[in-house]
């Protein structure tokens, strides 16, 4: 079972090479596509397939802001020939992810196929570490081979790679072992039940408030540190504001995602950034200790 | 591995019908276009038609249409031909291929059709 | 409908020769141009698509080139198992083939 992402992949190529980027779609070039084109080849070693994005299969939504379906392959072909003259193309791509019914906790193993050339898309973070603590996955890049798995997550704490535990592994070391593996690598990892921010742990609800702006500001202050895995929280409101109108928010609730994008393992300054450019309606996905006391 | 495999083929007099069947295995049929090409004994390959892959498009040669109809059946990884009304140019040995990117990148062994009298 | 004209119809060279076998469309097909070889009682083998793409599992010494109008096929060093019928295909509009080449031994 499968859900659909999209993302947008940046590629940087040459006039006479391209982007190592084949579509295919429809019956012949010039008829009017009733579907997006597919990715039908990546060439070896192309920018295509290092930027670790893309895949046999994938659909192209819009080449450089310019939509696929309802026009013909070779306006799509083109499109990709203009871009690769300016050196540079903007992808919107539809992908799968795959539906993985996983434990939120305990320890199992995750295997990603991978090239020498091309990164599985997991960032990991030695942030805070203390001697014998794990490493943790703190962003996982939309679109990459780690991500359409399904499985992983930012917060996952990462316990070896191929059976090398990385116990008192240097953060640079892993991300080494990692860049250094081919063909299939075989992930340890451990979940813990606080990585969930789905689940409502004890004492605890989570829940969604919309605030619309009409122009003015949200009327609260947040805080954090850069460090990606500490909670962002409500530090203030502004009297009689439109946030501490809604009755919802509270000073000391936990946010968990601003727009639908997840605040797990984001620092301060990402979520900052996520409520300046949120636009005129902002959805926000709050946290709340039930049993804090008053 | 994918293969194509062509059955329906014989011997019909003119102005009869016949329906060539392609039974596809190896890949996700339904993602796919798919074709059929003729080449008539001694002669050269002749596009037939083509069919997308939901089966929502369908083109013809203009010496088939209006008695040839293309279709196909993702539920059972088929591609169709019926052709009504047959001529004694329409004898040649008929492939079913896999269109790909405006191409055919996979061919069946091939059918022989006879339209005599 | 667009046309394919193939030349020269036949040919005939020796093991090693370089040979190059060129393809006309009656108006201009971009590089949507594809090559096949055909062996007496087979089903066509894809050899060139887009032009100049070599198909997977296809030898080097097949090359095709040519964008618009005029496309060749060229077998750099002819081989035993090379002398066969060769087709051009376009896919610009529909789908048409040009009537063939056919790679005889000298």
């Known amino acids: 079972i499968v859900h659909t992402e999209t993302t947008e992949v940046v590629l940087c190529g040459d006039p006479l090479s391209g982007f190592g980027l084949q579509l295919q779609g429809g019956i012949f070039a010039t008829e009017t596509l009733s579907s997006p084109p597919l990715v039908c080849f990546i060439e070896p070693d192309s920018p295509a397939e290092r930027c670790g994005l893309l895949q046999v299969g994938d659909r192209v939504l819009s080449i450089n802001g310019i939509a696929t379906e309802d026009g013909t392959m070779e306006e799509a072909n083109q499109l990709l020939r203009d871009a690769a003259l300016a050196h540079k193309v903007v992808l919107e791509v539809e992908f799968d992810v795959a539906e993985s019914v996983i434990p939120s906790s305990g320890t199992f193993h995750v295997k990603l196929p991978k090239k020498r050339s091309v990164e599985l898309g997991i960032t990991i973070s030695s942030a805070s570490r203390k001697r014998g603590e794990p490493l943790i996955i703190s962003d996982i890049k939309k679109g990459s081979v780690a991500h359409r798995t399904g499985t992983l997550e930012p917060g996952d704490k990462l316990l070896a790679i191929d059976n090398i535990r990385l116990d008192n592994c240097p953060m640079e070391d892993a991300v080494q072992i990692l860049r250094q593996c081919e063909d299939l690598v075989k992930l340890k990892i451990r979940k813990d039940e606080d990585n969930s921010d789905e689940l409502e742990t004890t004492g605890a609800v989570s829940y969604t408030v919309e605030l619309k702006r009409y122009g003015g500001p949200l009327g609260i202050t947040i805080s954090g540190t850069e460090e990606p895995f500490d909670p962002i929280v409500i530090s203030g409101l502004t009297k009689r504001g439109l946030a501490e109108r809604t009755g919802a928010i509270h000073v000391g609730d936990r946010i968990l995602a601003i727009n639908n994008v997840s605040l797990k393992g984001r620092p301060l300054s990402e979520a900052i950034h996520l409520l300046q450019v949120a636009g005129e309606t902002v959805t926000l996905k709050i946290k709340k200790q039930l049993d804090r006391p008053l | 591995e994918v293969q194509l495999l062509e059955s329906g083929g014989g011997l019909v007099q003119p102005g009869g019908s016949l329906r060539l069947s392609c039974a596809a295995s190896g890949f996700t049929f339904s993602s796919y276009a798919m074709s059929w090409v003729r080449q008539a004994p001694g002669k050269g390959l002749e596009w037939v038609s083509a069919i997308s892959g939901s089966g929502g498009s369908t083109y013809y040669a203009d010496s088939v249409k209006g008695r040839f109809t293309i279709s196909r059946d993702n539920s059972k990884n088929t591609l169709y031909l019926q052709m009504n009304s047959l001529r004694a140019e329409d004898t040649a040995v008929y492939y079913c291929?896999?269109?790909?990117?405006?191409?055919?990148?996979?061919w069946g062994q091939g059918t022989l059709v006879t339209v005599s009298s | 409908d667009i046309q394919m004209t193939q030349s020269p119809s036949s040919l005939s060279a020796s093991v090693g020769d370089r040979v190059t076998i060129t393809c006309r469309a009656s108006?201009?097909?971009?590089?949507?141009l594809n090559w096949y070889q055909q062996k007496p009682g087979k089903a066509p083998k894809l050899l060139i698509y887009a032009a100049s793409s070599l198909q997977s599992g296809v030898p080097s010494r097949f090359s095709g080139s040519g964008s618009g109008t005029d496309f060749t096929l060229t077998i750099s060093s002819l081989q035993p198992e090379d002398f066969a019928t060769y087709y051009c295909q376009q896919g610009y509009y529909l789908l048409t083939f040009g009537q063939g080449t056919k790679l005889e031994i000298k």
């Open positions: 291929a896999r269109s790909h990117a405006s191409y055919f990148d996979y």
């Open positions: 108006q201009s097909i971009s590089s949507y």
